[in-house]
């Protein structure tokens, strides 16, 4: 949700941050393999090119950029966004009739655009919905036992534990780990009330749970979300993960063959969203002013008055639904089995104009423009372009993750980049981006080529933009591509410093969006131009536009972080020598590959393919091979989560300095060894064949 993102400000419209979507999971019934799916075509068969292809093709970048721009100029984005916000498709909860009807519309549009092939994946997944009979409820229990009803909320939090709890109520600001640590009172055995924003609902609940809270209430405060409607309902989900939480780490194919299982990311406490009006009613019974540093409106109070309790009843129920992911492909002319994936969430709990309408509209228009460029304008992409419309994004990128889980063993050898279109337009002031470092150079080139829709200046305004880029967050559909599958991914947005206030609410309508962004068509055009240029650069050039050298600086900064603890490391009788060596090997491998590329005969597609194959493996090899994708799905040592990550290793060392008795030395020794070998593995993969690897290790 919008309120889960926190972005840096970048003056002049160029910069970083993260705009994105949810997570994912998948149940598939089509047994075809990905290559089989892509094999068929509904357009005339294209001749297989010979060993060499004309070098002249590299000169077409300016032509293609201009052609894309011309098509963008004549495209009506707002008309499509408005269409997707009509009652025929609104609301479109995942797996519902309206979601399916929109899926069919997308599928028919892809066919009309004459894409090479259009297909669908069907999955059966479990989501959580409100009970049709029993109501969720928040009540104040007076000392004499009288009940004072606060609210039966219209919104809810999917994957809450369905249960009833009573206890004291305390405020925990945004519910970040830092917020909980800084509280002057204990939350142990109490319910906590937190405001939306800064981090995902799932992280708020996990943090509350780790501090032994018994339940969580989430509301939108007036300062962060200056919405007039105090009774506005809010929706979100609390799964600390992506995909179907009841088939963790594996796809939801025919679910009967799998043992019952559930994600460790599911909360063990109830969580419920409440309106601001309900929160203010609770504050009326609470005491203690909230700290000024919270920058919160004055109605905020800290603790429920003595002799009173709050009762939270959550009656959400599990529901098995059928979801459809819709795909269309434009086949590459040289390497059709390598593809860039462009995707957008289709479903929404409410009207979902900014949440899924804009992304779906961009997806449709990009598919139309690129198909047009291929069929009419002579664009011959070397690699394939897959357009994907995901369902159940609102429940944690379920559709997207299910697809990834279904093809885990092979997808990283085929899909080399994911471009996320979700929430690409939330404002106008800033251009923010979150991505794998492999894509930073491509992003920079694109920012130097695309003008801000309002200021008319190029998006590239800050040469230091890359240092301010934020990690992809769990609620972004690009996250599982990067952290689970090891596929470089990018998510971007035109947005404000403040959160878009209507995401996850019934006010996320076209009407509100166009009111807040009168230049909506121009901004959507710019978002499409950014994504379009990414696609051209990634599919047109002979060399894959993935800058493997960018991880050198990431590894270097990790080494710098570790160097602060060299005394601690020496005290344990350990050395960083092997880690330095692995980092050095990675550096040398990147230098060698760059030299290989410069010396290569660019027109020899076999040589180029060998080089590109090495580049494609880089991200995947940053997935720790030492943890199970089922237990720790987000295996990426930089961007994932869990004890195998480089940040966890550093946190563990910090703990040694802060509280040596809590420090786990055995865990650290493992972390250091496995991180070293993972980095060494990436260096080896980049070096190519085994006889090229200098193994003096």
């Amino acid at each position: 949700h919008h309120h889960h993102h926190h972005h840096h400000h970048h003056s002049g419209g160029g910069g970083s941050g993260g705009g994105g979507s949810g997570g994912g999971g998948s149940k598939g019934v089509e047994p075809k393999t990905e290559s089989e799916r892509l094999a068929g075509t509904e357009s005339p068969v294209r001749e297989e090119p010979g060993e060499d292809f004309p070098a002249a093709r590299r000169l077409y970048w300016d032509d293609l950029k201009r052609k894309l721009s011309e098509k963008l100029d004549s495209t009506d984005f707002t008309g499509t966004i408005k269409l997707l916000n009509e009652n025929s498709y609104v609301p479109r909860e995942a797996g519902s009739q309206k979601d399916e009807n929109l899926a069919l519309y997308v599928e028919n549009q892809f066919r009309e655009f004459k894409l090479s092939k259009v297909w669908r994946d069907q999955h059966f997944v479990k989501i959580q919905v409100k009970d049709s009979i029993g109501q969720n409820m928040v009540t104040i229990v007076q000392s004499n036992g009288n009940l004072d009803p606060v609210e039966s909320p219209e919104g809810y939090v999917a994957f809450s534990k369905p249960t009833e709890v009573s206890g004291k109520l305390v405020h925990a600001n945004f519910g970040t780990k830092k917020d909980f640590e800084e509280l002057s009172y204990s939350v142990n055995g109490s319910l906590v009330i937190v405001r939306a924003g800064e981090i995902t609902f799932a992280e708020k609940v996990a943090n509350a749970q780790s501090f032994n809270a018994i339940g969580v209430l989430i509301y939108m405060d007036k300062n962060k979300f200056p919405v007039v409607e105090a009774d506005l309902a809010l929706f979100g989900h609390a799964h600390l993960g992506t995909g179907d939480p009841y088939t963790p780490g594996f796809p939801s194919f025919n679910h009967t063959q799998f043992p019952p299982s559930q994600s460790s990311g599911l909360p063990n406490i109830p969580v419920q969203t409440i309106s601001r009006a309900a929160a203010e009613k609770l504050f009326g019974k609470m005491e203690g002013s909230c700290p000024a540093r919270w920058n919160i409106d004055s109605s905020c109070k800290l603790e429920l008055s003595q002799n009173q309790n709050v009762k939270l009843i959550v009656k959400n129920v599990l529901k098995e639904i059928k979801i459809l992911n819709i795909f269309g492909v434009i086949k590459g002319f040289v390497e059709p089995d390598h593809y860039v994936v462009v995707g957008a969430q289709r479903d929404a709990w409410g009207p979902g104009a900014a949440k899924s309408g804009v992304g779906t509209a961009l997806l449709l228009k990009l598919a139309q423009m690129f198909s047009d460029m291929v069929l009419k304008d002579g664009f011959q992409p070397s690699r394939s372009i897959i357009f994907a419309s995901w369902s159940a994004g609102d429940f944690g990128s379920v559709g997207a993750t299910e697809w990834l889980e279904g093809y885990l063993s092979s997808l990283h050898l085929k899909a080399f980049t994911y471009i996320n279109l979700d929430k690409a337009v939330l404002g106008t002031s800033n251009f923010k981006v979150s991505a794998s470092p492999l894509l930073y150079t491509l992003i920079e080139k694109t920012m130097q080529n695309v003008k801000h829709p309002v200021t008319g200046q190029f998006l590239y305004q800050d040469s230091n933009w890359a240092s301010k880029v934020e990690k992809l967050t769990l609620d972004n559909a690009a996250f599982p591509f990067l952290a689970y599958s090891g596929i470089p991914a990018v998510s971007f947005c035109f947005c404000e410093d403040t959160d878009y206030p209507y995401l996850g609410t019934t006010m996320d309508t076209y009407k509100e969006l166009i009111e807040r962004i009168p230049e909506l068509n121009k901004v959507a055009r710019a978002a499409a131009e950014v994504a379009g240029q990414f696609v051209i650069k990634l599919t047109h050039d002979v060399e894959l536009n993935l800058d493997y050298e960018m991880y050198n600086s990431k590894l270097l900064s990790f080494m710098k972080d570790l160097n602060q603890f060299k005394t601690d490391i020496r005290d344990m009788g350990l050395s960083l020598q092997w880690l330095y060596s692995a980092r050095g090997d990675y550096f040398r491998a990147t230098s060698r590959l760059t030299t290989d590329f410069h010396n290569a005969e660019k027109t020899n597609r076999f040589v180029m393919r060998e080089i590109n194959d090495r580049i494609m493996k880089v991200e995947y090899h940053f997935l720790s091979p030492y943890v199970s994708p089922r237990e720790s799905p987000f295996r990426h040592i930089f961007w994932g989560s869990g004890s195998h990550t480089l940040s966890a290793l550093v946190e563990n060392l910090k703990l040694r300095q802060k509280n040596i008795t809590a420090f786990n030395e055995t865990l650290f020794r493992n972390q250091l060894a496995l991180a070293t070998w993972t980095i060494q593995g990436v260096a080896n993969a980049l070096s190519g064949d085994i006889w090229n690897i200098d193994n003096e290790f």
Epitope: N87, P91, K98, N101, G350, T509
Partner: antibody, heavy 123, light 113 residues
Framework: EVQLQQFGVELVKPGASVKISCKAS????????MDWVKQSHGKSLEWIGD????????SYNEKFKGKATLTVDKSSSTAYMELRSLTSEDTAVYYC????????????????WGQGTSVTVSS | DIVMSQSPSSLAVSVGEKITMSCKSS????????????LAWYQQKPGQSPELLIY???TRESGVPDRFTGSGSGTDFTLTISNVRAEDLAVYYC?????????FGGGTKLEIK
């Protein structure tokens, strides 16, 4: 008891506009969509469009886009349909009807109907 | 748009008789996920507004006498009135609510001999 109250007759000149009202009672107005249906004399029924009073979103039959505009006033639980650039073809009885639950992702029939407003376009 | 065709356009029956009228849609109204047919029948008595009789092709609206029965699936639907009474004099419309725009049949006018 669910009731949709419409006013009987509107006599308007060609080229003019008319705004028909439909006041709902007996249920929570924002909980259900409101549909509008046209019936020309002796003819069948034609669906014009619907409005979701909770989200303030609409859908129109392509045939009536540019002709009809649907709005609501939540405070008075009233739905409105404005018809513009009227011609003799627009002479008909116009009904409002309660549609499906506004928060539903599924389609539903129209379960309660107003008594209709007769619009006559004549110079 | 889905085209709804009703037949006959009119029929005259005597009180106490059983009659059936047909409604055909140009595409299936069956939603496979919930196995429901998105078809409704409305009754419009002279000078009155339409009233919902049947929805989901066969479910009677509350208060509707069990003389009225809806049946059919996919593209072919039937409304049966057994033991016709004088107050059943009306035009009966079928309507699909499976896909926007919602569309109605031309109606079947029931006259009493």
């Amino acid at each position: 008891e669910v009731q949709l109250q419409q006013f009987g007759v509107e006599l308007v000149k060609p080229g003019a506009s008319v705004k028909i009202s439909c006041k709902a009672s007996g249920y929570i107005f924002t909980d259900y969509n409101m549909d509008w249906v046209k019936q020309s004399h002796g003819k069948s029924l034609e669906w014009i469009g619907d409005i979701n009073p909770d989200y303030d979103t609409t859908s129109y039959n392509e045939k009536f886009k540019g002709k009809a505009t649907l709005t609501v006033d939540k405070s008075s639980s009233t739905a409105y349909m404005e018809l513009r650039s009227l011609t003799s073809e627009d002479t008909a009885v116009y009904y409002c009807a309660r549609g499906g639950y506004s928060g539903s992702s599924y389609y539903h029939p129209m379960d309660y109907w107003g008594q209709g407003t007769s619009v006559t376009v004549s110079s | 748009d889905i085209v709804m065709s009703q037949s006959p356009s009119s029929l005259a029956v005597s009180v106490g008789e059983k009659i059936t009228m047909s409604c055909k849609s140009s595409q299936s109204l069956l939603y496979s996920t919930n196995q429901k047919n998105y078809l409704a029948w409305y009754q419009q008595k002279p000078g009155q507004s339409p009233e919902l009789l049947i929805y989901w092709a066969s479910t009677r609206e509350s208060g509707v006498p069990d003389r009225f029965t809806g049946s059919g699936s996919g593209t072919d639907f039937t409304l049966t009135i057994s033991n016709v009474r004088a107050e059943d004099l009306a035009v009966y419309y079928c309507q699909q609510y499976f896909i926007y725009p919602r569309t109605f049949g031309g109606g079947t006018k029931l006259e009493i001999k």
